[in-house]
Amino acid sequence: EKAMVDGSWLDLAKRSKLEAQPFAHLTINATDIPSGSHKVSLSSWYHDRGWAKISNMTFSNGKLIVNQDGFYYLYANICFRHHETSGDLATEYLQLMVYVTKTSIKIPSSHTLMKGGSTKYWSGNSEFHFYSINVGGFFKLRSGEEISIEVSNPSLLDPDQDATYFGAFKVRDID
């Protein structure tokens, strides 16, 4: 009986530790995509609807804030698309990019952790164009550090929750 009690206590402890593991999956807020043809910061994301969830991390002012020190896996998926029903592209040569940036408040600094993308020729003769970027990496993050996303040509973003999103989850403590 004692062994059983110990075992279930261990399970509970494991489970509560897992439940306390920070994670976030944020999806684009399609009603508030900024305009611009150069690099802009995406500040409007959902954290509590559809596929979007957050636990033991904070989303504020368009940035994902780390609450616990640790090693985190960060990822971002950005889809760009254009269909001729919305009009024509003013230029057919495009640089479609995403930048995942870490900002530190304690020591004011900003670093690009990951970037991805390509230059594209989207011919006006085609009805539909699509391009997807996925970046991911393992980073040591400290409490208070902020993660943000910048993209080029936001007017071409695919606004679906399965297309444009980013997130993080803690993998282990810092020894």
């Epitope: 611009g36 043809s37 254009h82 919305s86 009009g87 592209l89 003013a90 040509n153 936001p154 007017s155």
Partner: antibody, heavy 126, light 103 residues
Framework: QVQLVQSGAEVRKPGASVKVSCKAS????????IHWVRQAPGQRLEWMGW????????KFSQKFQGRITVTRDTAASTAYMELRSLRSEDTAVYYC???????????????????WGQGTLVTVSS | EIVMTQSPSSLSASVGDRVTITCRAS??????LNWYQLKPGKAPRLLIY???SLQSGVPSRFSGSGSGAEFTLTISSLQPEDIATYYC?????FGQGTKVEIK
């Protein structure tokens, strides 16, 4: 206020060319596209082509490809449309119109024509 | 190539009447539809863009609705100055026009 002022009426013989100008004022000319649209007597409006005033990129209707040239002079805030090898069915009122999309804010030419010129009547007759 | 079809091609109504013009696209165009007013000898005027957004300076008696392939322009109370031809438009394609007259 935004204004597009076009050149005056023209009469041409079949086979000739015509060049219509469209002078813009009241906004930053380079930040918008200019479209050319025409209306022949008793016909619907017909889109001919556009020019991105910022970079000079153009797109034309297949119907006019090879006969039309659209240019711009950013210093003079003026767009020009030249139509060659004129025939009688090119008799129409030709309009320039500004696309509502600001190219600084995005790169999609949306085909909302928010300001129009007063129109230029081109008559093709022998 | 998308084709825009308007109906009716002309109509006659009294001042104060509610007038409705329909525009159909040959395939779905989401909400990318605009309406213009043309008066002889005058520059065309954008009334409605994006199917239902009223262009700045246009009287509120004009309204637009619809999505997909079927759209309507409504004049809630026809005024004498509304005598004109109205065109729907999606990108490069225009409807054939609806001429509105006063009875």
């Amino acid at each position: 206020q935004v204004q597009l002022v076009q050149s005056g009426a023209e009469v041409r013989k079949p086979g000739a060319s015509v060049k219509v100008s469209c002078k813009a004022s009241g906004y930053d000319f380079s930040n918008y596209a200019i479209h050319w649209v025409r209306q022949a007597p008793g016909q619907r409006l017909e889109w001919m082509g556009w020019i991105n005033a910022g970079n000079g990129n153009t797109k034309f209707s297949q119907k006019f490809q090879g006969r039309i040239t659209v240019t711009r002079d950013t210093a003079a805030s003026t767009a020009y449309m030249e139509l060659r090898s004129l025939r009688s069915e090119d008799t129409a009122v030709y309009y320039c119109a500004r696309d509502h999309s600001n190219m600084v804010r995005g790169i999609i030419i949306a085909y909302y024509f928010d300001y129009w010129g007063q129109g230029t009547l081109v008559t093709v007759s022998s | 190539e998308i084709v825009m079809t308007q109906s009716p091609s002309s109509l006659s109504a009294s001042v104060g009447d509610r007038v409705t013009i329909t525009c159909r696209a040959s395939q779905s165009i989401s909400r990318y539809l605009n309406w213009y007013q043309l008066k002889p000898g005058k520059a065309p005027r954008l009334l409605i863009y994006g199917a239902s957004s009223l262009q700045s300076g246009v009287p509120s008696r004009f309204s637009g609705s619809g999505s997909g392939a079927e759209f309507t322009l409504t004049i809630s109370s026809l005024q004498p100055e509304d005598i004109a031809t109205y065109y729907c438009q999606h990108t490069r394609a225009f409807g054939q026009g609806t001429k509105v007259e006063i009875k």
